[in-house]
Amino acid sequence: QGWQAFKNDATEIIPELGEYPEPPPELENNKTMNRAENGGRPPHHPFETKDVSEYSCRELHFTRYVTDGQCRSAKPVTELVCSGQCGPARLLPNAIGRGKWWRPSGPDFRCIPDRYRAQRVQLLCPGGAAPRARKVRLVASCKCKRLTRFHNQSELKDFGPEAARPQKGRKPRPRARGAKANQAELENAY
């Protein structure tokens, strides 16, 4: 089927702290060192980013007509295209989750479709042909999913909510940012 763009806008997916992924157990080594468990204070400058939206996994809303040969839908349909970053390597305070953040390289995420919806459309055809109904599958939401050593890019691993662990050890340094700093930024993807 062909698509004709009509208009688009964007929604950003910026997960809350509880949604920060814990890399699957089989991908982490057995050392107990990690930032949330060991209660380090949130760092300031180096881990902050000025524009959170610059790195978010975006849901771009496209309004399109469905076409099939010479036939075209009577009304446009709106669907999402997943785009942008799942989060930068530059992390926000308190947004580290249980990842081994001090490593120079880490888990890779992708912004891809999460849920789909089916929509019935009516196709109008030229030359007086009878309209026909057709069901199309449209992207309903986007999500960051991890590439793992056991998955290729077409089999991406989901991450789900994770309860933030109570912190122990050092007391956090006062945060320089506002509420937006609570929003977790995930690993970088493209």
């Epitope: 060192m33 930068p88 001090w102 890779d108 590439l147």
Partner: antibody
Framework: EVQLVESGGGLVQPGRSLRLSCAAS????????LHWVRQAPGKGLEWVSG????????DYADSVKGRFTISRDNAKNSLYLQMNSLRVEDTALYYC????????????WGQGTTVTVSS | QSVLTQPPSASGTPGQRVTISCSGS????????VNWYQQLPGTAPKLLIY???QRPSGVPDRFSGSKSGTSASLAISGLQSEDEADYYC????????????FGGGTKLTVL
Amino acid sequence: EVQLVESGGGLVQPGRSLRLSCAASGFTFDDYALHWVRQAPGKGLEWVSGIGWEDDMIDYADSVKGRFTISRDNAKNSLYLQMNSLRVEDTALYYCAGNSRGYGGLDVWGQGTTVTVSS
Amino acid sequence: QSVLTQPPSASGTPGQRVTISCSGSSSNIGGNTVNWYQQLPGTAPKLLIYSNNQRPSGVPDRFSGSKSGTSASLAISGLQSEDEADYYCAAWDDSLEGSYVFGGGTKLTVL
């Protein structure tokens, strides 16, 4: 200016020990993860070890595990590498490097200190 | 032998576009982000690309990174004489207890 300066290299016999130091300036030291990377003469880069801001946030390359110990002293803005049971194959230029972003590569490097292990 | 495989050499003329490949496996490039470093003769390495395709401030946009499956690439467009250097890819490797692995390096010659 962000700066890392390594010291402590030299000529040492196989089986002996050496301690490398890295002095940092120009940035908030304990916000950085720090690493040692070495480069044998005419060869490529080899990561040796890395540390977060606490002593339980540590990784080692298999080739040095059990022989080398990485540590840091945030009060002194210093990183250390204690190298024991040195081998001829440990001969290299040792760089101190840091990353200011989680999973964001080593974005600060020193100029290196040379370790030569030879009898 | 390096865990990540790079061609030992590459070359191009000024203004040309050159691509350097880096091949790994599912335990490194396949699941983790890739970084690229430039090492000019007689100097310390410099971070060129982090997290597959992100440029640190100060790195010209002539340099770009990409990743697909278990391979990554560094592209340099509008090649300049000062780009003559060794280039290294690197990624975390999840096998065993894990380590940060580098490619063997690619010597880029500007003809």
